[in-house]
Amino acid sequence: CDLPQTHSLGNRRALILLAQMGRISPFSCLKDRHDFGFPQEEFDGNQFQKAQAISVLHEMIQQTFNLFSTKDSSATWEQSLLEKFSTELNQQLNDLEACVIQEVGVEETPLMNVDSILAVKKYFQRITLYLTEKKYSPCAWEVVRAEIMRSFSLSKIFQERLRRKE
């Protein structure tokens, strides 16, 4: 399973779609900016074996899919772009699931570092809480879109590090 190669392509497509989804100027939402505390240390790529890296990436993509599959998201974004973005996320999730199956030879590899998974989950809980507090306003969604783009870009660096390790 060529995880970094497969995933980097999907990641790039997802980033392009996220960029296209922008509807309002980020400059008009500067007052709504927020630090969500992206768990950068979980993506430094040094302490991970491949199976654990797969599971952290899957967590991030699944949580992103959950976030953009809500009714409030559907009411905010242009439908065809949102559907393309969701389809891309789903394809990445399927690819990562298949990677675990292909890793069957390294059977004893633990699938996760619980702390890393929880850090990603809590990061998305903070994003959801922010949206709720801001009553899912257009600016709040714009801030979240920019944040997800940033987190995808950071995870892309993580994947490239993984590729070098391989």
């Epitope: 199976a51 699944q62 699931e97 298949a98 675990v100 699938l111 998974i117």
Partner: antibody, heavy 126, light 110 residues
């Protein structure tokens, strides 16, 4: 916690079709698949197929292709199973089942069934 | 297509005894994608063990899962009266997604 509520029992003639519904409530996400699993009287469990409600993407077990259609509504989150050309051996309890968003890590979430409906008995009889 | 074979078909035991249930796959299965369920008469199945060895919420620690490759086991250290039921193993394979169940092992009171 997710609750799955299925439609009531049905009696059908051979050759006809049946449609069973499954309404999800609680901590639901349309980004997780809903599956249909059946159990013939005194027999084991058999996976039939699944749908990802967010996208309408379906996957069907080989045994049922050509006879099965799974659809879903996103609001309220409801999955439907339609089975056509019914035979006597299709008499079974039909369950809808879904994963849990609380399973850690999420990569295991969609590989299992954490929540099950109460089951809907479909009897095929002439 | 993967076939899961469970053995024995029926296990007759007394409360307090231990039980070991086997699930054998026709080809390699990732232990991460091996799940066990318990089903009592007239009830829907209940998730017991996932990821090969992780207990689902509320499952007592007398239940444990193990194994890898093609051979997996569910162990019940000391049977309680409420444990008597049918147990199913299930595997997942992708792509495309396919869920496969074993035929079940019935654990009955001797």
């Amino acid at each position: 916690e997710v609750q799955l509520l299925e439609s009531g029992a049905e009696v059908k003639r051979p050759g006809s079709s049946v449609r069973v519904s499954c309404r999800a409530s609680g901590d639901t996400f349309s980004s997780y698949p809903i599956s249909w699993v059946r159990q013939a009287p005194g027999q084991g469990l058999e996976w039939m197929g699944r749908i990802l409600p967010a996208l309408g993407v379906t996957n069907y077990a080989q045994n049922f292709r050509g006879r099965i259609t799974i659809t879903a509504d996103k609001s309220p989150l409801t999955a439907y199973l339609e089975l056509s050309s019914l035979r006597f051996e299709d008499t079974a309890v039909y369950y809808c089942a879904s994963p849990s968003a609380d399973i850690i890590p999420s990569i295991l979430g969609t590989t299992l069934f954490a929540f099950w409906g109460q089951g809907s008995l479909v009897t095929v009889s002439s | 297509e993967i076939v899961l074979t469970q053995s024995p078909g029926t296990l007759s035991l007394s409360p307090g005894e231990g039980a070991t249930l086997s699930c054998r796959a026709s080809q390699n299965v990732s232990r991460h994608y091996l799940t066990w369920y318990q089903q009592k008469p007239g009830q829907s199945p209940r998730l017991l063990i996932y990821g090969g060895s992780s207990r689902a919420t509320g499952v007592p620690d007398r239940f444990s899962g193990g194994g890898s490759g093609t051979d997996f086991t569910l162990t019940i250290s000391r049977l309680e009266p409420e444990d008597f039921a049918v147990f199913y193993c299930q595997s997942y394979h992708s792509p495309p997604p396919v869920y496969t169940f074993g035929q079940g092992t019935k654990v009955e009171i001797k």
